[in-house]
Interface confidence: medium
């Protein structure tokens, strides 16, 4: 039977407001609202916590019955949908011990684990997996790419009691390995032998100058010479113009700096490798994975552009159950969500096409009107000219 420590699907309307606590550490934290967003697979099932104000910190958390993951697997899972086409903002969760004062949660509150996607500009598109080990936040040494599209994605972290881990996105493994190898929790197992040093006669030069090679006698020629084809202009006046000097050209016989040819170094010993010894500071820790106390799940984020929706939170000790839960939530609505988005995009495209068409027709109609006005003006002008032409002879007659 799986142990489900925390599960939140926001299926009871405003009920979530009694389970989630806003931090009062800052007066201007952003507000979360319950929403399934502009597009969804199922309007009710896809309701989650949505960030609603741009350029804000967000700090909201929910507590649960405290537990320890000692001797058992820990699975943390949730869905994130950046429907605002996020450019900079967190989509991660933090797991805290139950000693956290939820009303004072903030960016420096000590947590056990931080996990989830983080995007900021072109440089950051990663899944954070940070463990607090002996009071220090230790980041994973691998780069795990997160999803940066507008759709809902399922993020899963599995931490096992054999000190191995797995990260899944959309129920597919994207990274796995050992905690000791992929984080710098412990000093290295091996260190360079402090008593060893490179022997003085160790020659690391693969090639050397050929000692038998010497510079040819005719090697040294100037780089530039006076142009032998240049002639003093006939109108050159030395008193006025000074002494005539021919222009300088590149010397075709110039050979540059002479270097002796290279030969294989007969004394070459290769690159000296510093011998390693067991690090006396190293001692294995079989309980890196273990925490005495988990009691709060928190959203402690900053977002440039709001609109991210968090849903389907799960903390359990059962990998299979988590996978099944993911398939029954995210898995069931993802196709319909894409369908609705595609439909909206198509409607938007048609609307824009229609507007473009209408605008062009209006412009054409305006142009036509202008042309007609222009033609009328030209006709009026012609009539006026004709009238004037008829008047002139008449005037002349009267004057005669």
């Amino acid at each position: 039977e799986p142990a489900v420590y925390f599960k939140e699907q926001f299926l009871d309307g405003d009920g979530w407001t009694s389970r989630w606590i806003e931090s009062k550490h800052k007066s201007d934290f952003g507000k979360f609202v319950l929403s399934s967003g502009k597009f969804y697979g199922d309007e009710e099932k896809d309701k989650g916590l949505q960030t609603s104000q741009d350029a804000r910190f967000y700090a909201l958390s929910a507590s649960f019955e405290p537990f320890s993951n000692k001797g058992q697997t820990l699975v943390v899972q949730f869905t994130v949908k950046h429907e605002q086409n996020i450019d900079c903002g967190g989509g991660y969760v933090k797991l805290f011990p139950n000693s956290l004062d939820q009303t004072d949660m903030h960016g420096d509150s000590e947590y056990n684990i931080m996990f989830g996607p983080d995007i900021c500009g072109p440089g950051t598109k990663k899944v954070h997996v940070i463990f607090n080990y002996k009071g220090k936040n230790v980041l994973i040494n691998k780069d795990i790419r997160c999803k940066d599209d507008e759709f809902t994605h399922l993020y899963t972290l599995i931490v096992r009691p054999d000190n191995t881990y797995e990260v899944k996105i959309d129920n597919s493994q994207v990274e796995s390995g050992s905690l000791e190898d992929d984080w710098d929790f412990l000093p290295p197992k091996k260190i360079k032998d402090p008593d060893a040093s490179k022997p003085e006669d160790w020659d690391e030069r693969a090639k050397i100058d050929d000692p038998t090679d010497s510079k040819p006698e005719d090697w040294d020629k100037p780089e530039h010479i006076p142009d032998p084809d240049a002639k003093k202009p006939e109108d050159w006046d030395e008193e006025m113009d000074g002494e005539w000097e021919p222009p300088v050209i590149q010397n075709p016989e110039y050979k540059g700096e002479w270097k002796p040819r290279q030969i294989d170094n007969p004394d070459y010993k290769g690159t000296w490798i510093h011998p390693e010894i067991d690090n006396p500071e190293y001692s294995p820790d079989p309980s890196i994975y273990a925490y005495d106390n988990f009691g709060v799940l928190g959203l402690d984020l900053w977002q440039v552009k709001s609109g991210t929706i968090f849903d389907n939170f799960l903390i359990t000790n059962d990998e299979a159950y988590a996978e099944e839960f993911g398939n029954e939530t995210w898995g069931v609505t993802k196709a319909a969500e894409k369908q609705m988005k595609d439909k909206q995009d198509e409607e938007q495209r048609l609307k824009e096409e229609e507007e473009d068409k209408k605008r062009k027709e209006e412009e054409e109609a305006e142009d036509k009107e202008d042309d007609e006005d222009k033609d009328e003006d030209e006709e009026d002008e012609e009539d006026k000219e004709e009238d004037e032409e008829e008047d002139v002879p008449g005037q002349a007659k009267d004057e005669l």
């Epitope: 450019d87 960016g107 983080d118 500009g121 072109p122 440089g123 940070i130 980041l139």
Partner: nanobody, 116 residues
Amino acid sequence: QVQLQESGGGLVQPGGSLRLSCTASGSIAAFGWYRQAPGKQREFVANMYVGGSIRYSDSVKGRFTISKDNAKNTVYLQMNILKPEDTAVYYCNALVRFEGRNDDYWGQGTQVTVSS
């Protein structure tokens, strides 16, 4: 600690232009401009990341341009074809990010009024 200093606001007629400046001290991941009209929420206008990518809100796209002078550590917002609805206090924002932590810093704001 990051300090931000905005300048360039003022009164301008509809269709006119203004250039806002924001000078920063410190190492910054992203610069942004936001605005707040009386009685309204602060809203995103434009931003620019260290890597060079730029984003604008739909309401200013094609009219406003964000740019940066790296030597002066100054970010600019060139505002053209201004409309009365662009009237607001404009704030410069700098985002500093480190190991999953964020710190944001705000300027004191500069008033832009578009009116005939």
